[in-house]
């Protein structure tokens, strides 16, 4: 079978600072040198692209400067971090991996990681 399998955790809880990290791992059917990773958010049947990065194997992932994502890669594993999350950003975050070069191209889409974001309670005013 030449399909590419992508694995990611089912659930992740964002930190109180609105940061969530998870690992996206793919079983590569070929020897890719260039890989593209995209994070998609699915909520209420709407799908939006959160961020995307293309990297050369052995090099770091480079997201756009204004991206809310950062990441590192190690072999067939990508460690993704999404920051600036609020409660309204709770949803299913899907890892999409594409082996871009050399041909043939392969597509792999994970089942998604449900990220729960809880806005921190505001600190009560204290009178001293």
């Amino acid at each position: 079978c030449k399909a590419m399998h992508v694995a990611q955790p089912a659930v992740v809880l964002a930190s109180s600072r609105g940061i969530a990290s998870f690992v996206c791992e793919y079983a590569s059917p070929g020897k890719a040198t260039e890989v593209r990773v995209t994070v998609l958010r699915q909520a209420d049947s709407q799908v939006t692209e959160v961020c995307a990065a293309t990297y050369m194997m052995g090099n770091e992932l480079t997201f756009l400067d204004d991206s809310i994502c950062t990441g590192t890669s190690s072999g067939n594993q990508v460690n993704l971090t999404i920051q600036g999350l609020r409660a309204m950003d709770t949803g299913l975050y899907i890892c999409k991996v594409e082996l871009m070069y050399p041909p043939p191209y392969y597509l792999g889409i994970g089942n998604g990681t449900q990220i729960y974001v809880i806005d921190p309670e505001p600190c009560p005013d204290s009178d001293f």
Epitope: C1, R36, L107
Partner: antibody, heavy 118, light 108 residues
Framework: QVQLVESGGGVVQPGRSLRLSCAAS????????MHWVRQAPGKGLEWVAV????????HYADSVKGRFTISRDNSKNTLYLQMNSLRAEDTAVYYC???????????WGQGTLVTVSS | EIVLTQSPGTLSLSPGERATLSCRAS???????LAWYQQKPGQAPRLLIY???SRATGIPDRFSGSGSGTDFTLTISRLEPEDFAVYYC?????????FGPGTKVDIK
């Protein structure tokens, strides 16, 4: 809304060249993989070529490799297919197609007919 | 290259009947990457089903897809007059992206 409009088709002699264009609107070309798919008269669909995202990667069907070149102009939001050394078997309707977020072919143009005949 | 075979080549049915179209792959296709398209004469193909079973935007629920591995099915639960057309399956999980030869659904 998403719209793809092909142009540039016509009748051409074997061995000659032709360039097809596809004007895209309603989305940004560089955010998607863009494909050309063709259909010979009375036949099925055949994938021809794809250009990925930033344009640095292009993949071709074996039947057109070395003869066809896919490209795009992001400033014009336009996709191209340069077809050289045309053969009779290249006669087909050529469709410009957007690769959707899930990888499927979600939007198709109306097609442009290319006839290679002497 | 993944070769897709569709059967039957032609399906003759009456409006209101159920249509079952088959698509078989030469090697396993992850169900995430199998699509069905409808094409009417003189028109471009239209995406019906992707991921083997997910309906595309605006597609009526009489169209459904199923299957996994090498065997996939498109079912039209109750044929409407506008459903008589050619249907193609396609795998988009690896290049070259391949289509089946099509099944023509015509009026009996």
């Amino acid at each position: 809304q998403v719209q793809l409009v092909e142009s540039g088709g016509g009748v051409v002699q074997p061995g000659r060249s032709l360039r097809l264009s596809c004007a895209a609107s309603g989305f940004t070309l560089s955010s998607y993989g863009m494909h050309w798919v063709r259909q010979a008269p009375g036949k099925g669909l055949e994938w021809v070529a794809v250009i990925w995202y930033d344009g640095s990667n292009k993949h071709y069907a074996d039947s057109v490799k070395g003869r066809f070149t896919i490209s795009r102009d992001n400033s014009k939001n336009t996709l191209y297919l340069q077809m050289n050394s045309l053969r009779a078997e290249d006669t087909a309707v050529y469709y410009c197609v957007r690769g959707g977020i899930w990888g499927n072919f979600d939007y198709w143009g109306q097609g442009t007919l290319v006839t290679v005949s002497s | 290259e993944i070769v897709l075979t569709q059967s039957p080549g032609t399906l003759s049915l009456s409006p209101g009947e159920r249509a079952t179209l088959s698509c078989r792959a030469s090697q396993s296709v992850s169900s995430n990457y199998l699509a069905w398209y409808q094409q009417k004469p003189g028109q471009a193909p239209r995406l019906l089903i992707y991921g083997a079973s997910s309906r595309a935007t605006g597609i009526p629920d009489r169209f459904s897809g199923s299957g996994s591995g090498t065997d996939f099915t498109l079912t039209i639960s109750r044929l409407e007059p506008e459903d008589f057309a050619v249907y193609y399956c396609q795998q988009y999980g690896s290049s070259p992206f391949t289509f089946g030869p099509g099944t023509k659904v015509d009026i009996k």
